[in-house]
């Protein structure tokens, strides 16, 4: 028989201490960084892989331009605040009682200010578009093929439903997958689209964070698909607010 | 192969203590939960609680919290129930179980009589 | 506590029958549910976990199946050896919590 410890462990979150200390002998796996309890049936809030990143040791086929109030993660990483869900708190502040507001993927939308900054809601990002450019090939992708293979991606790899893949857009060498999902969308059990994408880019930058799992390897009509760059851009259901000094910059 | 031998029967006066042991063999002790079940005569199972012995973790069913407590001693792989403040009604058969995801091994069973 | 209700607490049924029994939670318990077999002056034995897994060496004849509140062990053609007390318990949360059982007799 092998031992309990061999099967304890989080196939979605390798950044988790799993032991099958749970009820009636379940393997029960909590995250670094949270001590909180993860569903590793699911994928993990992208809060919680934030905090546990940053508790490890230190090592048409037209394009679509992003609205004038998309955002990106300019300010990398940070030790977020989760609330008991796992979910960013509207509210970060770091050690230096300097704060801001944030949407639910932990992308700052406000400036920053000091511990009297009030951010009421947490805002939902209904709307990602993740910009790739691959490497070079000898021809362009079959739009189509490429297409399909992204959606099988996010339905199989993440566990996102395909209604929330609104589109894949190409145009050599740049790729646009869209992900919508409205507040009203998303049932009890979705994988939400913040941590699909956060999952996609880390996959894509070869730091997997599932268990065990190979990295992505992407492949359309058995052709490797090799990213180069990535920029990912967040719309959120309310526009952000930031002052005209920063959007004149 | 998994084995988990009790100790053998006990009769106790009310108000007494009792210590059930269970000793584990074919497997890693500090692997796997064992949890403590008991049974009245001719009635149902009774989940009492649960030790792992890999960290010395435990849970109890708060109807015996105060009167029940788990141990494990890992240098001879074996787990131990002791029950104290003895009443006529905790007459049963007390087994002790190997738990992974649900999936159970079972002592033999101790018989623990309660009678003045 | 989650408690489980187990239906019916006995039933008659002959070699050959398919026997159903089911268990029912008082909240959602995510699949963690498993069944037992107990006999006369003998130890529990385990016979499906995570609702519907079968454990090594039990015969195919046993099978689990539901989910949520509403679970289900079936026999399909009892045997002789059968008979005896089955149980159900969730482990989804703690306490552990059984079902009353359900004894198997024969007509």
């Known amino acids: 028989h092998t031992a309990a410890q061999d099967n304890c462990t989080c196939p979605t979150n390798k950044m988790t201490v799993c032991s099958p200390d749970g009820p009636g002998g379940r393997c029960q796996c909590r995250a670094l960084g949270s001590g909180m309890a993860v569903d590793c049936s699911t994928l993990t809030s992208k809060c919680l892989l934030l905090k546990a990143r940053m508790s490890a040791p230190k090592n048409a086929r037209t394009l679509v331009r992003p609205s004038e109030h998309a955002l990106v993660d300019n300010d990398g990483l940070y030790d977020p605040d989760c609330d008991p869900e796992g979910r960013f708190k509207a509210r970060q502040c770091n050690q230096t009682s300097v704060c801001w507001c944030v949407n639910s993927v932990g992308v700052r939308r406000t400036d920053k200010g000091d511990l009297s900054l009030r951010c009421d809601e947490l805002v939902r990002t209904h709307h990602i578009l993740i910009d790739l450019r691959h490497r070079p090939t000898a021809g362009a992708f079959n739009h189509s093929d490429l297409d399909a293979e992204l959606r099988r991606l996010f339905r199989e790899r993440y566990r996102l439903h395909p209604k929330f893949v609104a589109a894949v857009h190409y145009e050599q060498p740049t790729i646009q997958i869209e992900l919508r999902q409205n507040t009203s969308q998303k049932a009890a059990g979705d994988v939400d689209i913040g941590d699909a994408a956060y999952y996609f880019e880390r996959d894509i930058k070869g730091e997997s964070l599932f268990q065990g799992r190979g990295g992505l390897d992407l492949r359309v009509r058995g052709e490797p698909l090799q990213v180069e760059r990535t920029l990912i851009y967040y719309l959120d259901e309310i526009p952000p607010k930031f002052s005209m000094k920063r959007l004149t910059a | 192969q998994v084995q988990l031998v009790q100790s053998g029967a006990e009769v106790k006066k009310p108000g007494s203590s009792v210590k059930v042991s269970c000793k584990a063999s074919?497997?890693?002790?500090?692997?796997?939960?064992i949890n403590w079940v008991r049974q009245a005569p001719g009635q149902g199972l009774e989940w009492m609680g649960q030790i792992y012995p890999g960290s010395d973790s435990f849970h109890y069913n708060q109807k015996f919290q105060g009167r029940a407590t788990l141990t494990a001693d890992k240098s001879t792989n074996t787990a131990y129930m002791e029950l104290s403040s003895l009443r006529s009604e905790d007459t049963a058969v007390y087994y002790c179980a190997r738990f992974f995801e649900g999936l159970a091994y079972w002592g033999q069973g101790t018989l623990v009589t309660v009678s003045s | 506590d989650i408690q489980m209700t187990q239906s019916p607490s006995s039933l008659s049924a002959s070699v050959g029958d398919r026997v159903t029994i089911t268990c029912k939670a008082s909240?959602?318990?995510?699949?963690?549910l498993s069944w037992y077999q107990q006999k006369p002056g003998k130890a529990p034995k385990s016979l499906i976990y995570?609702?519907?897994r079968l454990v090594d060496g039990v015969p195919s004849r046993f099978s689990g199946s539901g989910s949520g509140t509403d679970f289900t062990l079936t026999i399909s053609s009892l045997q002789p050896e059968d008979f005896a007390t089955y149980y159900c318990l969730q482990y989804d949360e703690f306490p552990l919590t059984f079902g009353g059982g359900t004894k198997v007799e024969i007509k």
């Open positions: 995570r609702a519907n």
């Open positions: 074919g497997y890693r002790f500090t692997d796997y939960v």
């Open positions: 909240q959602g318990i995510n699949n963690y």
